[in-house]
Amino acid sequence: MMTGTIETTGNISAKKGGSVILQCHLSSTMAQVTQVNWEQHDHSLLAIRNAELGWHIYPAFKDRVAPGPGLGLTLQSLTMNDTGEYFCTYHTYPDGTYRGRIFLEVLESSVAEHSARFQIP
């Protein structure tokens, strides 16, 4: 039985050229996290954090994705094309798979505010 919940940073905005932290947190379960996959809106993988082998940044993002903090991901040098959905997939044992969603809006405006509140989708 899957008892856990994924909390995410929800809908966030950040300015073009800046950076943003994508953060998910799995709570209310004792399940062991074996791997966390970070996916972009087109289902392409950005990064994998394997519990035994550590962080793996995909080639297309290696110059502007930084691992962390924690199991989160920092996306740098933002472009307008980065606007869209991002998904964190927690592979756990014995529960199975948990998935969280974040919507990132990249703004031209220099006054874009980056909200970092956690919410349960």
Epitope: I48, N50, L53, H56, P59, K62, H91
Partner: antibody, heavy 123, light 109 residues
Framework: QLQLQESGPGLVKPSETLSLTCTVS??????????WGWIRQPPGKGLEWIGS???????YYNPSLKSRVTISVDTSKNQFSLKLSSVTAADTAVYYC???????????????WGQGTMVTVSS | EIVLTQSPGTLSLSPGERATLSCRAS???????LAWYQQKPGQAPRLLIY???SRATGIPDRFSGSGSGTDFTLTISRLEPEDFAVYYC??????????FGGGTKVEIK
């Protein structure tokens, strides 16, 4: 389709270093989902995993061989390489390179293999 | 390390018969991490089954895998002439390290 091809000397002297290269064709070694591994098989015996490497250089090794093994990657040539130091006759084997799906979780396996190359350790 | 013991060492059967190969682990292995390979003389191993029960691309449905924990089975429902080969099980953990079983030879009776 993706193919792997091992190359290197077929004869190595005892106490020297065995060096092999695996060339990946039909696809990029910079596939974020896969490691690239080495497995060996002594004549008439079973399979033994040696170690695996990620495109960015991260590795994991068989602890029983770790002190003698170095695996490296050259993304510009789409190749990865194995060095095994201080070899003895016990290292005589067919050496295979293979694609390692350790990051695919429910599909963890070596799904694509090279044809293998025989390496004999003898003076 | 996790030791995989395959039995029997040799299986003598005729074409058309059913083959049942066993792989026993010295400690529990996630079924997600258990694979089976076929190897013919002078050839590289070929992936048959991953995740204990999923057939790899292009593998005929006469091959099936099952099991969990410490006991896993590869079944060939009706042996074809090309199925006579050596079969290896493998567990793909990182720590303890991944290992292969000693193999089962399926030979023509």
């Amino acid at each position: 389709q993706l193919q792997l091809q091992e190359s290197g000397p077929g004869l190595v002297k005892p106490s020297e270093t065995l060096s092999l290269t695996c060339t990946v064709s039909g696809g990029s070694i910079e596939s974020g989902s896969y490691y690239w591994g080495w497995i060996r098989q002594p004549p008439g015996k079973g399979l033994e995993w040696i170690g695996s490497i990620y495109y960015s250089g991260g590795t994991y090794y068989n602890p029983s061989l770790k002190s003698r093994v170095t695996i490296s990657v050259d993304t510009s040539k789409n190749q990865f390489s194995l060095k095994l130091s201080s070899v003895t006759a016990a290292d005589t084997a067919v050496y295979y390179c293979a694609r390692d799906g350790v990051l695919t979780l429910n599909k963890r396996s070596f799904d694509i293999w090279g044809q293998g190359t025989m390496v004999t350790v003898s003076s | 390390e996790i030791v995989l013991t395959q039995s029997p060492g040799t299986l003598s059967l005729s074409p058309g018969e059913r083959a049942t190969l066993s792989c026993r682990a010295s400690q529990s292995v996630s079924s997600s991490y258990l694979a089976w390979y076929q190897q013919k003389p002078g050839q590289a191993p070929r992936l048959l089954i991953y995740g204990a029960s999923s057939r790899a691309t292009g593998i005929p449905d006469r091959f099936s895998g099952s099991g969990s924990g410490t006991d896993f089975t590869l079944t060939i429902s009706r042996l074809e002439p090309e199925d006579f080969a050596v079969y290896y099980c493998q567990q793909h953990t990182v720590r303890p390290p991944l290992t292969f079983g000693g193999g089962t030879k399926v030979e023509i009776k």
